[in-house]
């Protein structure tokens, strides 16, 4: 899947655009907003009625090297008594992000953008019931 | 620090860190995931902490369309379909990386940008602060 060109007619390609070889693009991986703080609600992963755990992977040939994934703890949801209610379902909520992959081919190194699907947490849903005729 | 695995026969010139600027292939390697959460699942309607999805569009960014979740209620939906204010609907937020055209309007020059998105909502037990 290619990155779309700027489609709006009022966008004229500025003279200041850097020269880029065909079939590739220039990517600055110094992240904009890198130091922006994230204030998440505390411990929502254990306070949720559909609680989750986190797993982490780390790959030095991926940028970012660290990717954290959520995994729902239960099939059902936790009720007011703290017990699992299997009449409801804990389901994962997912979000795409981009990563840069470094590839070694012989002695040359190339870089590839990759879309990664990250599970960010879980939510409790009413199940879809399929009636069999 | 960490050393990057490399072919032992190659000259030892490669930096263990990623360079600041790289040339990348225009094709994005991915499983063709569905970027419209409304089409991929109806969890946003079936959840006990339902949310609405708002389209955020920016032609200077890739992906240009990002869907933002906003919880519909402060409380959660109980078995009777009513809002229970003893529980809280809270957004699940995630930092993601996107591409920002830099310089602006340039077709093939980008910089990574970190943005915070609300992906959905979950129902949590509230933190109760007791006032002395």
């Amino acid at each position: 899947r290619k990155i779309p060109k700027v489609g709006h007619t009022f966008f004229q390609k500025p003279e200041s655009c850097p020269p880029v070889p065909g079939g590739s693009m220039k990517l600055d991986i110094g992240i904009i907003n890198e130091n922006q703080r994230v204030s998440m609600s505390r411990n929502i992963e254990s306070r949720s009625t559909s609680p989750w755990n986190y797993t982490v992977t780390w790959d030095p040939n991926r940028y970012p090297s660290e990717v954290v994934q959520a995994q729902c703890r239960n099939l059902g949801c936790i009720n007011a008594q703290g017990k699992e209610d299997i009449s409801m379902n804990s389901v994962p909520i997912q979000q795409e992000t981009l990563v840069v992959r470094r590839k070694h081919q012989g002695c040359s190194v190339s870089f590839q953008l990759e879309k990664v699907l990250v599970t960010v947490g879980c939510t409790c849903v009413t199940p879809v019931i399929h009636h069999v005729q | 620090g960490i050393t990057i695995p490399r072919n032992p026969g190659c000259p030892n010139s490669e930096d263990k860190n990623f360079p600041r600027t790289v040339m990348v292939n225009l094709n994005i390697h991915n499983r063709n995931t569905n970027t419209n959460p409304k089409r991929s699942s109806d969890y946003y309607n079936r959840s006990t902490s339902p949310w609405n999805l708002h389209r955020n569009e920016d032609p200077e960014r890739y992906p240009s369309v990002i869907w933002e979740a906003k919880c519909r209620h402060l409380g959660c939906i109980n078995a009777d379909g009513n809002v229970d204010y003893h529980m809280n609907s809270v957004p699940i937020q995630q930092e993601i990386l996107v591409l920002r055209r830099e310089p602006p309007h340039c077709p093939n020059s980008f910089r990574l940008e970190k943005i915070l998105v609300s992906v959905g909502c979950t129902c949590v037990t509230p933190i109760v602060h007791h006032v002395a």
Partner: nanobody, 119 residues
Framework: EVQLVESGGGLVQAGGSLRLSCAVS????????MGWFRQAPGKEREIVAR???????AYAEFVKGRFTVSRENTKNTVYLQMNSLNIEDTAVYYC?????????????WGQGTQVTVSS
């Protein structure tokens, strides 16, 4: 200059437990995410666990509930409690610190502590 010093490694029998500690000095400990990594002979370094500034913890798949990472901000220390150790857990264990973002690396590393699990 930020310094990380690991301790608590040693020789333990399979099925046993160890508690690793990592003391951090020279920086603002409470603002760092902390990671535990390990490197076995002839293998690449791999992440074991990480803990962010506000508590959430994440573990590598192979941990399977056997290890617990925790931090004590008042003591500038991070811990790795390792239970049900097996021979495959033999490695040098490293503690690392970095800016608390998913997209930041680990800028500071300890020298490592050897963990040997015998049968």
């Amino acid at each position: 200059e930020v310094q990380l010093v690991e301790s608590g490694g040693g020789l333990v029998q399979a099925g046993g437990s160890l508690r690793l500690s990592c003391a951090v000095s020279g920086g603002t400990f409470s603002t760092y995410k902390m990671g535990w990594f390990r490197q076995a002979p002839g293998k690449e370094r791999e992440i074991v666990a990480r803990i962010s500034t506000n508590g959430p913890t994440a573990y590598a798949e192979f941990v399977k509930g056997r290890f617990t990472v925790s931090r004590e901000n008042t003591k500038n220390t991070v811990y790795l409690q390792m239970n049900s150790l097996n021979i495959e857990d033999t490695a040098v264990y490293y503690c690392a610190a970095g800016y608390d973002s998913l997209f930041a690396g680990y800028d500071y590393w300890g020298q490592g502590t050897q963990v040997t699990v015998s049968s």
